[in-house]
Amino acid sequence: GSQHIRAEKAMVDGSWLDLAKRSKLEAQPFAHLTINATDIPTGSHKVSLSSWYHDRGWAKISNMTFSNGKLIVNQDGFYYLYANICFRHHETSGDLATEYLQLMVYVTKTSIKIPSSHTLMKGGSTKYWSGNSEFHFYSINVGGFFKLRSGEEISVEVSNPSLLDPDQDATYFGAFKVRDID
Amino acid sequence: GSQHIRAEKAMVDGSWLDLAKRSKLEAQPFAHLTINATDIPTGSHKVSLSSWYHDRGWAKISNMTFSNGKLIVNQDGFYYLYANICFRHHETSGDLATEYLQLMVYVTKTSIKIPSSHTLMKGGSTKYWSGNSEFHFYSINVGGFFKLRSGEEISVEVSNPSLLDPDQDATYFGAFKVRDID
Amino acid sequence: GSQHIRAEKAMVDGSWLDLAKRSKLEAQPFAHLTINATDIPTGSHKVSLSSWYHDRGWAKISNMTFSNGKLIVNQDGFYYLYANICFRHHETSGDLATEYLQLMVYVTKTSIKIPSSHTLMKGGSTKYWSGNSEFHFYSINVGGFFKLRSGEEISVEVSNPSLLDPDQDATYFGAFKVRDID
């Protein structure tokens, strides 16, 4: 009898251990991706940033995938998404083509099933970077809480990519899962 | 027999209650620290802000430690870190020496074991605060998801600390644990 | 005997299933509210924004209530609150009343029990939007971790509401529960 009880208890323990592990949200997905400065595109128009580090310095990823410049969701859920984008110019870099700049970031979601791309978050500023100052800097931060489905892709677009600050503490984006979809 | 079963059940309940409590991530650590305006340093270069409130108004801390101007991690994990820094100048505040300002924040991590300090996040802007306007204001927000180990310390550095807005809703930084390290 | 044991196990399983569900923090509350552009107030002074979407596009709400322009907390806890506010002006919109603007956001908490309103977070910038440029843009992001009690209300105030960008990716605020109050 007591042997049987022990077996039952083991079953209970076992199933609950599974549940407990799962309640850790199947190892909650996250990513923190930092700019790969060796491959920043040029131009002043809106361009998609496709080169990001995912496994060096502060960059890391778990239960999400980074492919073709996009952060791919592997697990349905509600995620907090964020991006920090820094722009800078020093007079030693040469003259700016224009002193009036539109420094912007767009965090977009692409659904493969229904091929479509939508902006989740945008931020930025128009700036007047005059020749009277030898150095200019500006940072944008955006963040928000979004429902993401497995297979959806997150990407980052910016204007004036050639002005991006290439430091890992300056230009990055990320996501972490907060909760399941009911 | 049934008494024995009840005892077994109590064991199961007890152990799972512990596990459930633990699954609350040992009372998930967090901190929200607000600027202590009575002790803001001077200087124009990057200075570390060491005076923060942790237990008044919006400021609070749990399962982390605030000591010597640094937020100390007591529990390994992945944390979301954030900072909001406001700068302001009114013509009655004093004799501003320059219109060209670099208003910056740096959130840094210091490891005691391997004495080293690294910037996790930076943000800010160069600003032209002209005498044509009697009041100037600018805020920076940064946030990101980082792996922190017990004993590591988080601190905040800013440029032009004498321009800081001393309100608790203006200048603050914080952290909250999102998940364990696998 | 073994039937009795199975009943006991079912009881254990059942109660633990409840606990597990509850440990999901009673379906963790969240909200992401996007600006309702059909009803943006005018003026340049600080005004409360009362028209937000909660159920279209990126906007969503769960276990919180949106009423009378305020986000109402239904469950005690520690929440991460955030807001992203974009301002813009194009010369085709007509002349600005002044080139010197104070573009600000204030995230406030109102307690009904003790009728009082307090600012949790503020951000923004003074801007010089000169006639030399045909388009101006500026975004603010704020975020922080706060203890909220059931019945408390979160609202958003801005200066110069007529300059708000009405896009859902531009002007929004939100909250998500991170942990219980001990």
Epitope: N132 | T42, G43, S44, S93, G94, D95, L96, A97, T98, E99, Y100, L101, Y128, S130, G131, N132, N160, S162, L163 | -
Partner: antibody, heavy 122, light 107 residues
Framework: EVQLVESGGGLVKPGGSLRLSCAAS????????MSWVRQAPGKGLEWVSG????????YYPDTVKGRFTISRDNAKNSLYLQMNSLRAEDTAVYYC???????????????WGKGTTVTVSS | DIQMTQSPSSLSASVGDRVTITCKAS??????IAWYQQKPGKSPKLLIY???YRYTGVPSRFSGSGSGTDFTFTISSLQPEDLATYYC?????????FGGGTKVEIK
């Protein structure tokens, strides 16, 4: 070599006007706030005006406010002090001084010119 | 305005002596005090700023200390070339004010 050279001093009657100039060289003038500091014969130092690096902020003590005007021309690396309604007590050596980098609200002076003498007498 | 009271107004010391000058502010100026040296017929020269920081190129025998309202300037070993008048200045709040000066003579 970092240098400040004052000029424009001289003898002037009470109620009269004078314009002092300071030529800067050897440093990026536009990056620095500047001041005028005076020293009456056999006396100590007295700050009389300051101007921000871009020239949009000007500061004066009550003793000269409304009578003196500081200005600068960053393109010419030059600082000026227009002195009106001069009084006998304005007699002094006037030094042009560069404000050192430091806290944006704090002014101390790391480079000084040799000075130009202003005498107000009838 | 913040008044700066310097003492003594003059002193005489021998080469190698330790010389101390004090400056008292009429209100708290934290550590916002600068010290200048003015040799006869010359313009002032910055020695110390923020109470204790030596300016670039200033010999190590010159030092400063203090905070709040009471400040000290020290020449650890007086040299013949230190013959000058020394001034303190508060750089805490405008208008920027100077002490009356201390004339240091060599015995």
């Amino acid at each position: 070599e970092v240098q400040l050279v004052e000029s424009g001093g001289g003898l002037v009657k009470p109620g009269g006007s004078l314009r002092l100039s300071c030529a800067a060289s050897g440093f990026t003038f536009r990056n620095y706030a500047m001041s005028w500091v005076r020293q009456a014969p056999g006396k100590g130092l007295e700050w009389v005006s300051g101007i921000s690096s871009g020239g949009t902020y000007t500061y004066y003590p009550d003793t000269v406010k409304g009578r003196f005007t500081i200005s600068r021309d960053n393109a010419k690396n030059s600082l000026y002090l227009q002195m009106n309604s001069l009084r006998a007590e304005d007699t002094a050596v006037y030094y042009c001084a560069r404000r050192d980098y430091g806290d944006v609200y704090e002014w101390y002076f790391d480079v000084w010119g040799k000075g130009t003498t202003v005498t107000v007498s009838s | 305005d913040i008044q700066m009271t310097q003492s003594p107004s003059s002193l005489s010391a021998s080469v190698g002596d330790r010389v101390t000058i004090t400056c008292k502010a009429s209100q708290d100026v934290r550590t916002s005090i600068a010290w200048y040296q003015q040799k006869p017929g010359k313009s002032p020269k910055l020695l110390i700023y923020s109470a204790s920081y030596r300016y670039t190129g200033v010999p190590s025998r010159f030092s400063g200390s203090g905070s709040g309202t009471d400040f000290t300037f020290t020449i650890s070993s007086l040299q013949p070339e230190d013959l000058a008048t020394y001034y303190c200045q508060q750089h805490y709040s405008s208008p920027w004010t100077f002490g009356g000066g201390t004339k240091v003579e060599i015995k």
